[in-house]
Amino acid sequence: GPVWRKHYITYRINNYTPDMNREDVDYAIRKAFQVWSNVTPLKFSKINTGMADILVVFARGAHGDFHAFDGKGGILAHAFGPGSGIGGDAHFDEDEFWTTHSGGTNLFLTAVHEIGHSLGLGHSSDPKAVMFPTYKYVDINTFRLSADDIRGIQSLYGDPKENQRLPNPDNSEPALCDPNLSFDAVTTVGNKIFFFKDRFFWLKVSERPKTSVNLISSLWPTLPSGIEAAYEIEARNQVFLFKDDKYWLISNLRPEPNYPKSIHSFGFPNFVKKIDAAVFNPRFYRTYFFVDNQYWRYDERRQMMDPGYPKLITKNFQGIGPKIDAVFYSKNKYYYFFQGSNQFEYDFLLQRITKTLKSNSWFGC
């Protein structure tokens, strides 16, 4: 069955049951996600606007899918397996009486079960498992996943120690001068450089030592966390931001309406599900898209892919690859490639690496 092909997953609570305080709903859902993040490399972040991976909905009766709820009792909730659109979404029957305790239906316990489905788990035949198909109240203060639940989820995502690249369990601000720091995406925006990581971005103004950290949502509330690639076309005052199979267009620092759009509108084949890194070269008026160990070249004037791509990164960028995390263009001469905590200054005219740096070298660390 399907799984999320990333470790950083967003959720959004679309609406709140009147049965509970909003804070109690937030807490129950947050703790339910935490149950699964404790035993996997997955990290969950709540967003309040825009498109989340997992939408949490309280609804009664017919509510926009094929599986209308049935009134009090019976079906308590359902959730869709990982995927785009409705994929991952968890629906809770508003005709139940949702609670923080043993009376009515406990939201936390039900949410743990449904989030299991949202992550790709099916039902378990072990009556002690939270993924057993029938609801049974257990003391939420001593609640633990069964061995079967843990085995199931780790068979899909592995255990927490496989998450060395995401050392940020509580979404706190990453330490800027951590020698192991890596970035999700980097791009110039005018005379500034934006460094994206999780929910955050750092702003480096050229030639100034000072850097400021910001929440992505504080600048662009409609954008998701975990931006994976970015590039700028400075002459048009445009910045393109990528996450999963979607991209957003920012013009003059403002998000354009009618976005996100599919990355496939650039002409990528179906198997491309996300972009690792992207960079625009104004000399050639071409954008380079890096996906796993390959790259594509896109003609921004003709708005189409150049023929003969993809090509292997290692073949055409000597010393770079096989995969990269981020890249940006600077000084009319260099690409700066980021791989984990390392960075490579690459002269695209000489076609070779001219300097090796730490990824956070821009911050005077």
């Epitope: 509510h63 899918d65 397996g81 409705i86 994929g87 489905h117 009618n258």
Partner: antibody
Framework: EVQLLESGGGLVQPGGSLRLSCAAS????????MHWVRQAPGKGLEWVSG????????IYADSVKGRFTISRDNSKNTLYLQMNSLRAEDTAVYYC???????????????WGRGTLVTVSS | DIQMTQSPSSLSASVGDRVTITCRAN??????LNWYQQKPGKAPELLIY???SLQSGVPSRFSGSGSGTDFTLTISSLQPEDFATYYC?????FGQGTKLEIK
């Protein structure tokens, strides 16, 4: 390449029966919800029925409930629609369509067959 | 029960025009709305899913927006191959369709 090919349509009298088939190829059939959608001549689209990956759950439009039965044979990569007690208003092109995979039907139909025409007339 | 109302039912436009088709639900369907294009004698094709996500291979002149009860499909600059019938859909319910014709 994903392909869905319907067959079994034809002319049938009111009250008669017909069995439609949809042969799937180019993808792993068993994890997907599958559906039938129909279109009467010159009219819009109407969802008819859907079936879960295992075949254990079936759903129907009110207009066909009790008369039509959807089924599937995952070993043959084939979807079926058994239509009984046919009426003139069942005259339509019948399309099979693939839904998202998983425990629940999403209604996101990413691939469709070309359709097969069913005409109910005396 | 949920109902979908699509408008207009037909529309005449010229190549290069910007065209908007709307779809309204009688209750919130969140972003669970898809758009399909159908040409005469052909099967429908998925254009937009989840209200605003462009299906793979669909030109970027097509875009979708909306959530809750009100949704729109926009074609930014009509091409000759875009003249067809468009349907919005949510689970088992389709809109009545909008026939887009050449002016």
């Amino acid at each position: 390449e994903v392909q869905l090919l319907e067959s079994g349509g034809g002319l049938v009298q009111p009250g008669g029966s017909l069995r439609l088939s949809c042969a799937a190829s180019g993808f792993t059939f068993s994890p997907y919800w599958m559906h039938w959608v129909r279109q009467a001549p010159g009219k819009g689209l109407e969802w008819v029925s859907g079936i879960s990956p295992s075949g254990g759950e079936t759903i129907y439009a009110d207009s066909v409930k009790g008369r039509f039965t959807i089924s599937r044979d995952n070993s043959k990569n084939t979807l079926y629609l058994q239509m009984n007690s046919l009426r003139a208003e069942d005259t339509a092109v019948y399309y099979c369509a693939r839904d998202i995979w998983g425990a629940y039907a999403s209604g996101l139909f990413d691939y469709w067959g070309r359709g097969t025409l069913v005409t109910v007339s005396s | 029960d949920i109902q979908m109302t699509q408008s207009p039912s037909s529309l005449s436009a010229s190549v290069g025009d910007r065209v908007t088709i709307t779809c309204r639900a009688n209750q919130s369907i969140y972003t669970y709305l898809n758009w399909y294009q159908q040409k005469p004698g052909k099967a429908p094709e998925l254009l937009i899913y989840a209200a605003s996500s462009l299906q793979s291979g669909v030109p970027s002149r097509f875009s979708g927006s909306g959530s809750g009860t009100d949704f729109t499909l926009t074609i930014s600059s009509l091409q000759p191959e875009d003249f067809a019938t468009y349907y919005c859909q949510q689970a088992g319910i389709f809109g009545q369709g909008t026939k887009l014709e050449i002016k």
